[in-house]
Interface confidence: low
């Protein structure tokens, strides 16, 4: 379908005559009929196979004739057709005079013929004009033509017909030569295949959209590159769906329990080092000046009992201060001016004579200490408590604040391992010197029988269509991950084809 | 009409942390992505991140370590921290709205952006 | 990460046809989609959107602009070019992540 255009131009008849020659009175009132028909070596009456059209009276003898298409006019005159474009083509032009108003042929004199043209060739369908100038005897035409499609209809016969669309069907424009021009974001034979996020994962995503991407069962992520981990999972990861790997210094099922309580918790306080002993076990190595399990408590500096000779020890803001008993001086009242002679040794303590009597050594009976015999043992300082425990005094005894997994009077014997019931699915615990050991039942494995191994889903191979099967560990079932085409719990029905168009 | 605007502190010290704010008008961050984009003086432009229309980020992974980008939609703002400024950060530092949504159709509207000058 | 090679500088006459190109080190192409856009920016503004998708003239934009190419080599041609158009204009592609920015090259006049 497309249109045969014909733009006419000028008109010369400078006599104002017909072709007869005979002058028109009082000047000849110039009308066209144009006839197109199919392509004739030599054209001859007929039948005008591709249309007719007239004008209206455009002028007398000579005018220009305006271009009135903008406005609506019929410059350029207007020849359709409904049929595939031969390419070649016979165009007659008449100018007639018309004495009166109705210009009907019938209504008009035979002799009222001013001029007549035809001509034939080829013509290709485009945009560009084609100027021609006819001369006769007494008159002169110029004009000019081309062959446009109609609107939806392109291609070199104007034969092929595209609309363009943005709907279900299809999201496309058309190029000049009626194919198919996809609008962002679609791809396909008919543009209705969205194109998904860049990235999107080619199996493990799709999208129904542009730029989108959704996630095929058992992935995740906003371009579905990422698995999702078994159900539960609470420090580990994946690398296909339902899996549950533990990241390090996490152990079990779902990788909760705790091997790196140090990394995780920071137990120690104040600058302390920890480390990692077990499962949730630890053991914080104190600064100098602070105790506690967690090394929590500040130790006043006095605690060291740092004064000798009896000194008596005072806490100041940036460290301490002994107070020396008559005879002693010094930071740490270390040293004398006494002698045996001043009785200086305390509890029964024998004097002994040095240098020359310059100076002197006590020597304490037992269950007591220091320069001057003036201390009383302190039943910790052997550090009694095994594993890390720490020592306490208490009055006449002593007492050991044991680390977790140590009890006993001095912190000697291990909890054992398997009184936290890790073996998981009833599995039987042995406790061994270093650790323990897992004994599963049938159907589990792992070092803590976390594995379940005794039914696979996936064994009978319930996915078609090369889908890939995964299984879900908490239920016991089967996922399958349909490729591209294929839907349904076991991906066993094709997606339907694209609807067929009407063209 | 579309309009993007950056703010923040124009000096901030090495080490220490940069905040800037796009406030945006004229169209909803549920609909459209903002991205942060910056210039060193003479230099060409480096993505930095964007805060898509349904709130997820992405970041260039040469800045993964140091920089947060967030957003609240009920004041129409997009946020950047940067941490541990160095003294290669300072620059021009633009907001730019991603066209509906889609990259292809490119970043159809920038802030004047705001200038970063990194010094003690 | 994909980088995209402009040259630093260009000078052409008023009224004269310019053609700024950029080469990636790899495929900017999904389908039949050339994910390049190209930006004008000039002293002291902010980039301004020219082209996207490597041939679609941004809202607002003369038709003096116009992109073309596919793959990997791409350009953005001025004609005829004004005295308006001195500026640096920069390639970006959005294919991968991140999206990257061409080095820009700077128009001017002869």
């Known amino acids: 379908s497309g249109v045969f255009q014909l733009q006419l131009q000028e008109f010369i008849n400078e006599r104002g005559v017909l072709a007869s020659g005979r002058p028109c009175e009082p000047g000849c009132r110039t009308f066209f009929r144009v006839c197109l028909k199919h392509f004739q070596a030599v054209v001859s009456p007929g039948p005008c196979t591709f249309g007719t059209v007239s004008t209206p009276v455009l002028g007398t003898n000579s005018f220009a004739v305006r271009d009135d298409s903008s406005g609506g006019g019929r410059n350029p005159l207007q020849l359709p057709f409904n049929f595939t474009w031969p390419g070649t083509f016979s165009l007659i032009i008449e100018a007639w005079h018309a004495p009166g108003d109705d210009l009907r042929p019938e209504a008009l004199p035979p002799d009222a013929l001013i001029s007549k043209i035809a001509i034939q060739g080829s013509l290709a369908v485009g945009q560009n004009w084609l100027l021609d100038e006819q001369t006769s005897t007494l008159t002169r035409l110029r004009y000019s033509y081309r062959v446009i499609c109609s609107d939806n209809y392109y291609g070199d016969n104007c034969s092929r017909l595209c609309k363009k669309r943005n709907d279900h069907f299809g999201h496309y424009v058309c190029q000049p030569d009626g194919n198919l021009s996809c609008l962002p974001g679609w791809t396909g034979e008919y543009c209705q295949q969205p194109i998904c996020l860049s990235g999107c994962h080619e199996q493990n995503g799709y999208c129904s959209k542009p730029a989108e991407c959704l996630c095929r069962p058992g992935w995740q992520g906003r371009l579905c590159n990422e698995c999702i981990p078994h159900n539960g999972c609470r420090h580990g990861t994946c690398s296909t769906p339902w899996q549950c790997t533990c990241d390090e210094g996490w152990g079990g099922l779902f990788c909760d329990q705790d091997l790196n309580y140090c990394t995780h918790h920071s137990p120690c306080k104040n600058g302390a080092t920890c480390s990692n002993s077990g499962q949730r076990s630890y053991t914080c190595t104190c600064r100098p000046g602070y105790t506690g399990v967690d090394c929590e408590l500040e130790l006043s500096e006095c605690d060291s009992n740092p004064c000798r000779n009896g000194g008596s020890c005072k806490d100041q803001e940036d460290g301490y201060h002994c107070l020396c008993p008559p005879g002693y001086y010094g930071l740490h009242c270390e040293h004398s001016t006494l002698s045996c002679a001043d009785s200086p040794c305390f509890n029964g303590g024998s004097c002994r004579e040095r240098n020359q009597g310059a100076n002197y050594a006590c020597e304490c009976p037992p269950n007591f200490t220091g320069s001057n015999c003036e201390k009383k043992v302190d039943r910790c300082t052997s550090n009694p408590c095994a594993n890390g425990g720490q020592c306490l005094n208490r009055g006449p005894s002593r007492m050991c604040r044991c680390r977790p997994g140590f009890t006993g009077t001095y912190c000697e014997l291990h909890v054992s391992d398997c009184a936290r019931n890790p073996c998981a699915h009833g599995g039987t615990c042995h406790d061994l010197e270093n650790g323990l050991m897992c004994t599963c039942p049938a159907g589990f494995s792992g070092r803590r029988c976390e594995v379940r191994t005794s039914i696979d889903a996936c064994a009978s191979s319930p996915c078609f269509n090369r889908a890939t099967c995964y299984t879900d560990l908490s239920t016991d079932t089967f996922v399958c991950n349909c490729p591209y085409g294929f839907v349904g719990s076991r991906c066993e029905f094709p997606v339907g084809l694209p609807p067929s168009f009407p063209w | 009409q579309v309009q993007l605007k950056e703010s923040g502190p124009g000096l901030v010290q090495p080490s220490e942390t940069l905040s800037l704010t796009c406030t945006v008008s004229?169209?909803?961050?549920?609909?459209?992505?903002v991205n942060w984009v910056r210039q060193p003086p003479g230099k060409g432009l480096e993505w930095m991140g964007r805060?898509?229309?349904?709130?997820?980020?992405s970041h260039n992974s040469a800045l993964n370590s140091r920089l947060n980008i967030s957003r609240d939609t009920s004041k129409n703002q997009v946020f950047l921290k940067m941490n541990s400024l160095q003294t290669e950060d300072p620059g021009t530092y633009f907001c730019?709205?991603?066209?509906?949504?889609?990259?292809?159709?490119?970043?159809?509207?920038w802030g004047q952006g705001t200038s970063v000058t990194v010094s003690s | 990460d994909i980088v995209l090679t402009q040259s630093p500088a260009l000078a052409v006459s008023l009224g004269q046809r310019a053609t700024i190109s950029c080469r990636a080190s790899q495929s900017v192409s999904i389908s039949s989609y050339n994910l390049m856009q190209w930006y004008q920016q000039k002293p002291g503004h902010q980039p301004k959107l020219l082209v996207y998708a490597a041939s679609n003239l941004a809202s607002g934009i003369p038709a003096r602009f116009s992109g073309s190419g596919s793959g990997t080599d791409f350009a953005l041609t001025i004609d005829p070019v004004q005295a308006d158009d001195v500026a640096t204009y920069h390639c970006q592609q959005s294919k991968d992540h991140p999206p990257t920015f061409g080095g820009g090259t700077k128009l001017e006049l002869k």
């Open positions: 805060v898509m229309d349904d709130g997820d980020t």
């Open positions: 004229g169209f909803s961050l549920t609909r459209y992505a």
């Open positions: 730019a709205r991603e066209g509906d949504g889609f990259s292809w159709y490119g970043m159809d509207a």
